[in-house]
Interface confidence: low
């Protein structure tokens, strides 16, 4: 959980002395744009509890990890919800404090309620100043429940919430009807996302068993420890007056944490500091009680005494929560005799120990050969052992030698020496060698002599065009094999460098010296010839060609087709990017144009000899579309089409073509010729009864023209299935052209 604490100073006699402080123990917290993370935010949240507007509150940033809110002028300024937001990225966390007016009509018996999913939550509002009106309960500012004033039990109004779920979380309030909202009792309900003792996405994981009132976080399984306790299971008490995940913060003032409310990230909520209780956290724990809100009982055995801040203080030879366990000499477990790391890495070294009392994080240390002592940054506590994790500073060669892990408890000491070998990542002393080159690839021998330590685990080849600022391309290869760099640009110089790695984290060495390798590009020598061409429309031409058969691979990247329009003095170039291609469709040509055509092979930027030219005449463009096409059903098998001739014809029409298709049908359309171009009407026969058809038509002069609009018409019913549609124009039957 994020190390974030919101402290409320409850010296309520003078609101001007009231302050809220948000303290972050996170690295770089609160420094905003000039550091690692976003700043701490501390503000009053007026979304649910609104108070009369007053002078703006003052925010003071006390250093890098603390922000304080002051400037409260009257008691009503204090009432409501305050929040502090800290942490960066996915760790951004909001801590909430709810402040009740001590002069309110209703006061909460307990402000923060943390319950598990499925539990029953009971909120209790104590009558402080009685009014004989209904009590309204609200949830997050919205009406929730009403109680009659007679329903008070023992001077309290209770709200029972059975089978609570996470969406039930939020701010609850109990208010006398027609009373000022500032006289409400405000509560905070936190519902963990899992049942008791469980955490994780499906609540399948078991909580570590948080001690001293710590609460298991339902997302990450970590214990959120009460103020004044630390450790992965909150097993360790801080010194009096200290708080924060590592006990690194100190309560301000001479009276320590007296009069302070501490709010921590959910699902903990708020409480007094360790050793204090009461609505204003100004009462010391009664004898035999300790911890936050004095909620814990000591029950010390074997002569232990109860300290209200830390619990049982055990006499020599005893330990445990209740001094119930006798001491045993600690022992370091399963320490490897030799470890290997790479130079300048920052490895994590684990050291596990068992014993009685159980070793905690601070009791295990790591000693380097130069005598420097490292303290662990993290500890994993298991039933049979504690594993301390050490973050080792950047390793230097002098760190090679014998290191020592040492554990010390009141039960005694143990230590284990182990050898650390610091290895130097390999650095190539020479550039890689070029073995062969082609137009688009280079074959390279990567393994060269190197300084530093082996064995070589991977070889990386970095390459990019010479004088380029683009990113380097990288290929990872087997140390024993030659490398082929593919998909290169022909006739281009490449800067090539080797990087060697040895096993382990940080085993990558520096890049070796660069060398220049240049790709090849021989001139294509083969002359293609044009085999044929076919006019596929007024502006489309399909061309085919061949190449002479020669032994060996084809030297070429593709073909260039050139069309010369002598009339207009224009050249059209068409690139065919496959050297295997032997045909191409040229589109978008000018109808009725005479073209000279040739083809040549190209390689890189070099062109081979051109084929002997061919001369092609494209037909002129077709006529415009017929106008006003109309369809009319005559019978169950006949539909009559009528139209008007196209306008602005470039010459006499040779025929019309009608296209017939069943509406919604998946089959190919049928084309029917109307060979008497002077006609403006025709009958399509042999159609199916009760069937919807689509028709369109176009005219032909030397080439086919544009299609007309499409018309739709259905044949009449009750006919037999026809053989297929045919056309009749003025009693003259026409053939079917599919």
């Amino acid at each position: 959980a994020v190390d974030l604490t919101l402290l409320a100073n409850l010296r309520l006699t003078d609101p001007q002395r009231f302050f809220l402080t948000c303290v972050s123990g996170e690295a770089g917290a609160g420094r905003g744009s000039d550091a690692w993370g976003p700043p701490l935010l501390l503000e009053k949240d007026d979304r649910i509890v609104r108070t009369p507007p007053g002078p703006p509150l003052r925010l003071a940033r006390n250093g890098s990890h603390q922000v304080t809110l002051r400037g409260f002028s009257k008691p009503s300024d204090l009432v409501g919800v305050f929040s502090c937001v800290g942490g960066a990225g996915a760790r951004r966390t909001r801590v909430i404090y709810v402040h009740n007016s001590p002069g309110a009509h209703l006061l909460p018996d307990k402000v923060t309620h943390t319950v598990n999913k499925g539990d029953t939550a009971v909120l209790s509002a104590r009558v402080h100043k009685e009014k004989q009106t209904d009590v309204i309960w609200k949830s997050n500012g919205s009406y929730f429940y009403t109680l009659d004033w007679h329903e008070a039990q023992d001077g309290r109004f209770l709200l029972q919430l059975p089978n609570v779920q996470p969406p039930s979380s939020g701010i609850y309030s109990a208010t006398y009807l027609e009373a000022s909202p500032l006289g409400s009792a405000f509560f905070r309900l936190i519902v963990r996302g899992c049942g008791a003792g469980r955490w994780g996405p499906g609540c399948t994981k078991e909580c570590p068993g948080c001690l001293h009132g710590g609460v298991c976080h339902d997302h990450d399984g970590e214990c959120v420890c009460p103020p004044g306790f630390t450790g992965t299971r909150c097993e360790q008490a801080c010194r009096e007056g200290r708080f924060g995940q590592s006990c690194q913060e100190q309560c301000p003032g001479i009276s320590g944490c007296r009069g302070l409310t501490f709010c921590l990230p959910d699902p903990y909520g708020c409480s007094c500091g360790s050793g204090w209780r009461g609505s204003q956290c100004q009462e010391a724990c009664a004898p035999g009680h300790f911890g936050a809100d004095c909620r814990l009982q000591c029950q010390c055995q074997n002569g232990g005494t109860c300290d209200r801040f830390s619990g049982c203080v055990c006499p020599s030879g005893w330990h445990g929560v209740h001094c119930e366990k006798s001491d045993r000499i600690p022992q370091i477990l399963n320490m490897a005799s030799e470890l290997e790391f790479n130079l300048e890495t920052m490895p994590r070294i684990n050291c596990a120990a068992a014993g009685n009392p159980f070793p905690v994080r601070g009791s295990i240390e790591l000693r380097k050969p130069d005598g420097t002592v490292l303290l662990s940054t993290k500890a994993i506590v298991e039933p049979e052992k504690t594993t301390a994790e050490f973050e080792v500073p950047r390793l230097v060669l002098a760190d090679s030698g014998f290191w020592e892990c040492r554990v010390s408890t009141s039960g005694g000491q143990d230590s284990r020496r182990f050898k650390v070998n610091v290895k130097v990542p390999p650095v190539p002393l020479a550039a890689p060698r070029l073995l062969t080159k082609q137009s688009r690839q280079l074959v390279v021998s990567p393994l060269v002599s190197f300084s530093g330590d082996g064995p070589i685990s991977t070889v990386r080849l970095h390459y990019r065009p010479q004088d380029s600022t683009m990113d380097w391309s990288t290929i990872v290869v087997d140390p024993s094999e030659n490398v082929t760099l593919m998909n290169l640009r022909p006739k281009t110089g490449y800067s090539v460098r080797v990087q060697l790695s040895r096993p382990g984290e940080g085993g990558e060495g520096a890049w070796g010296p660069p060398t220049l390798m240049t790709t090849d590009c021989p001139e294509p020598l083969l002359q293609p010839w044009l085999e044929g061409w076919h006019v596929e429309g007024t502006d489309r031409l399909r061309v085919s060609w061949s190449l002479p058969l020669v032994p060996g691979p084809l030297v070429g990247d593709g073909f260039l087709l050139r069309l010369w329009d002598g009339t207009r003095g224009q050249e059209r170039r068409e690139n065919v990017s496959s050297p295997q291609a032997r045909t191409a469709l040229l589109t978008g040509l000018t109808p009725g144009t005479h073209y000279q055509l040739d083809v040549q092979l190209y390689h890189c930027t070099l062109l081979g000899p051109a084929s002997p030219p061919a001369h092609v005449l494209l037909p002129p463009s077709g006529p415009p579309a017929p106008r006003h096409l109309h369809a009319q059903a005559l019978s169950d098998s006949e539909i009559q089409l009528t139209w008007k001739h196209p306008e602005a014809l470039p010459g006499p029409i040779s025929k019309y073509v009608v296209e017939v298709q069943v509406a919604g049908g998946a089959g190919d359309p049928l084309w029917i010729d109307v060979d008497r171009p002077e006609e403006t009407s025709t009958i399509i026969r042999g159609l199916n009864a009760s069937t919807r058809y689509l028709f369109r038509m176009r005219a032909s002069i030397q080439g086919l023209g544009d299609w007309s609009n499409t018309v739709e018409e259905s044949t009449l019913g009750n006919g037999l299935q026809a053989e297929g549609p045919v056309q009749e124009s003025r009693a003259a039957e026409e053939g079917l052209d599919q």
Epitope: R31, A60, R61, N62, S64, H65, G71, Q248, Q250, P252
Partner: antibody
Framework: EVQLLESGGGLVQPGGSLRLSCAAS????????MAWVRQAPGKGLEWVSV????????YYADSVKGRFTISRDNSKNTLYLQMNSLRAEDTAVYYC??????????WGQGTLVTVSS | DIQMTQSPATLSVSPGERATLSCRAS??????LAWYQQKPGQAPRLLIY???NRATGIPARFSGSGSGTDFTLTISSLEPEDFAVYYC?????????FGGGTKVEIK
């Protein structure tokens, strides 16, 4: 009794470097924010730099940012000020002080730094 | 930056008289203000913190008042050892800033 004892001052040429030290005793050094304050001859007090107990947070006056580095060694109860690229205007008595939340409650006797060619 | 302006620059007072020193902040600093006394050749000494709280061992004749932007240090009856330079300092915001000082000299 709280005591702060500065050392390391002296004469240095412009562009030179100097490292000041402050030995602390009589209180739990690792719990407190520490600072350096300087006073040019015949002038007022100017805050230079501050460092938080863990050493993880530091602040500098604009006039020294990028040239001075404050650090601490809690195991040795010692505060340091590494001064690089020194200028004539850095000539001053440098005081080591303890920052008690809002105020400097204890001061050392000061060490004189003279930057001159 | 918060500017701290002290007035007057020099105050001439006879022993036994009352001295009133003023310090003004360029923006509100609540009560985050301290007063220091400095004698020639010596380090400064804390007198008042949080605008009005006397530091340990400081005589009762020294008192501080004010909040927001205007603050006052009062020496009710000057003793011979009180003639010195007095500085105010704010801790409301970074950078920490001192006033230019008020020299209290014997009239």
């Amino acid at each position: 009794e709280v005591q702060l004892l500065e050392s390391g001052g002296g004469l240095v040429q412009p562009g030179g470097s100097l490292r000041l030290s402050c030995a602390a005793s009589g209180f739990t050094f690792s719990n407190y924010v520490m600072a350096w304050v300087r006073q040019a001859p015949g002038k007022g007090l100017e805050w230079v730099s501050v460092i938080y107990p863990s050493g993880g947070a530091t602040y500098y006056a604009d006039s020294v940012k990028g040239r001075f580095t404050i650090s601490r060694d809690n195991s040795k109860n010692t505060l340091y000020l590494q001064m690089n690229s020194l200028r004539a205007e850095d000539t001053a008595v440098y005081y080591c002080t303890r920052l008690a939340v809002t105020h400097f409650d204890y001061w050392g006797q000061g060490t004189l730094v003279t930057v001159s060619s | 930056d918060i500017q701290m302006t002290q007035s007057p620059a020099t105050l001439s007072v006879s022993p036994g008289e009352r001295a009133t020193l003023s310090c003004r902040a360029s923006q509100s600093i609540s009560s985050s203000l301290a007063w220091y006394q400095q004698k020639p050749g010596q380090a400064p000494r804390l007198l008042i913190y949080d605008a009005s709280n006397r530091a340990t061992g400081i005589p009762a004749r020294f008192s501080g008042s004010g909040s927001g932007t205007d603050f006052t240090l009062t020496i009710s009856s000057l003793e011979p050892e009180d003639f010195a330079v007095y500085y105010c300092q704010q801790r409301s915001n970074w950078p920490l800033t001192f006033g230019g000082g008020t020299k209290v000299e014997i009239k």
